[in-house]
Amino acid sequence: ACDTATCVTHRLAGLLSRSGGVVKNNFVPTNVGSKAF
C-alpha cells in the first residue's frame, strides 16, 4: 500500500468519514503511520 504522507492523509480522511469522526484526538496524519491501516 502507498505510504507517502499524502496517501496516509487521504486514507485517514476516508477512515474518519466512515467512522463519522468518532476517533481519538491523536488520530491525525502526523501521528498515524502507514502500518495503522
Epitope: 502507498c2 492523509t9 491525525v28
Partner: antibody, heavy 119, light 107 residues
Framework: EVQLVQSGAEVKKPGASVKVSCKAS????????MNWVRQAPGQRLEWIGD????????NYNQKFKGRATLTVDKSASTAYMELSSLRSEDTAVYYC????????????WGQGTTVTVSS | DIQMTQSPSSLSASVGDRVTITCKAS??????VAWFQQKPGKAPKSLIY???YRYSGVPSRFSGSGSGTDFTLTISSLQPEDFATYYC?????????FGGGTKVEIK
C-alpha cells in the same frame, strides 16, 4: 479560516541562500504534513519535499537533497524552506501546501514567494 | 522518478464544450493522482484527489477517472472561469511528480 501566508519576494546572488517562511493558521499545525513545491517561469510544478511538523521528519526530492532544508517552528505554527548554493535555475515561485482534514478537507496552498537569483 | 506525461499540452475550446485531458504515468501509481487548476500569477487550486474524488466546493462539471497508469480529467461543460492550465500529480511514490500541464484557451 485556514490560511497559509508566505514571506515576501527575495532577490539573491548566485551562491547565496534563501529562507522562505509559511505561517499557518485556522487549523492544528502539527496535525498535517507540509509540502513545498516550486515553479520556474513557464515550467511545470516541482515537488521539493515534505515535513511532519509534529516530529520534524522530512522527505526530500533527491534533486534538492543537500541544498534544501525543511524546518518548522511549532510555537509559531510556521514552516520554513531554506535553499542554499543558489543558481539562476532556482529562480522560481515557491509554494507551501498542506492537505487538511479538520476543519475542512481540502488541499490548501500559500500565495507563493518569488525568489529571483541574479548577479 | 515517475514521469507524468500530459496531453495535449494546449487546447482551444469554447464555452459549453466538453474537454478531456489525459495523463499517463511511467509506472503504476494505483489511484494516487491529483489534478490542479492554475491561473496566471496564482497558486494552484486543487480539484481532484485519489483520481476521481472532488474536493468540497469543486463544481460537479469537473470529474476524474483512471487507475494504474492512465488518468483523465474531464470538464463536462466548459465555463468562462475554467480557462486555465491544468496539472496532474502522482503521490504514490516519492518524489511526487507533476505533468507538464495542459493550457485550456478560448477558441
Amino acid at each position: 479560516e485556514v490560511q497559509l501566508v508566505q514571506s515576501g519576494a527575495e532577490v539573491k546572488k548566485p551562491g547565496a541562500s534563501v529562507k522562505v517562511s509559511c505561517k499557518a493558521s485556522g487549523y492544528t499545525f502539527t496535525d498535517y504534513y507540509m509540502n513545498w513545491v516550486r515553479q520556474a517561469p513557464g515550467q511545470r510544478l516541482e515537488w521539493i519535499g515534505d515535513i511532519n511538523p509534529n516530529t520534524g521528519g522530512t522527505n526530500y526530492n533527491q534533486k534538492f537533497k543537500g541544498r534544501a532544508t525543511l524546518t518548522v517552528d511549532k510555537s509559531a505554527s510556521t514552516a520554513y524552506m531554506e535553499l542554499s548554493s543558489l543558481r539562476s535555475e532556482d529562480t522560481a515561485v515557491y509554494y507551501c501546501a498542506s492537505i487538511i482534514i479538520v476543519p475542512n478537507y481540502f488541499d490548501y496552498w500559500g500565495q507563493g514567494t518569488t525568489v529571483t537569483v541574479s548577479s | 522518478d515517475i514521469q507524468m506525461t500530459q496531453s495535449p499540452s494546449s487546447l482551444s475550446a469554447s464555452v459549453g464544450d466538453r474537454v478531456t485531458i489525459t495523463c499517463k504515468a511511467s509506472q503504476n501509481v494505483d489511484t494516487n493522482v491529483a489534478w490542479f487548476q492554475q491561473k496566471p500569477g496564482k497558486a494552484p487550486k486543487s480539484l481532484i484527489y485519489s483520481a476521481s474524488y472532488r474536493y468540497s466546493g469543486v463544481p460537479s462539471r469537473f470529474s476524474g477517472s483512471g487507475s494504474g497508469t492512465d488518468f483523465t480529467l474531464t470538464i463536462s461543460s466548459l465555463q468562462p472561469e475554467d480557462f486555465a492550465t491544468y496539472y496532474c500529480q502522482q503521490y504514490n511514490n516519492y518524489p511526487y511528480t507533476f505533468g507538464g500541464g495542459t493550457k485550456v484557451e478560448i477558441k
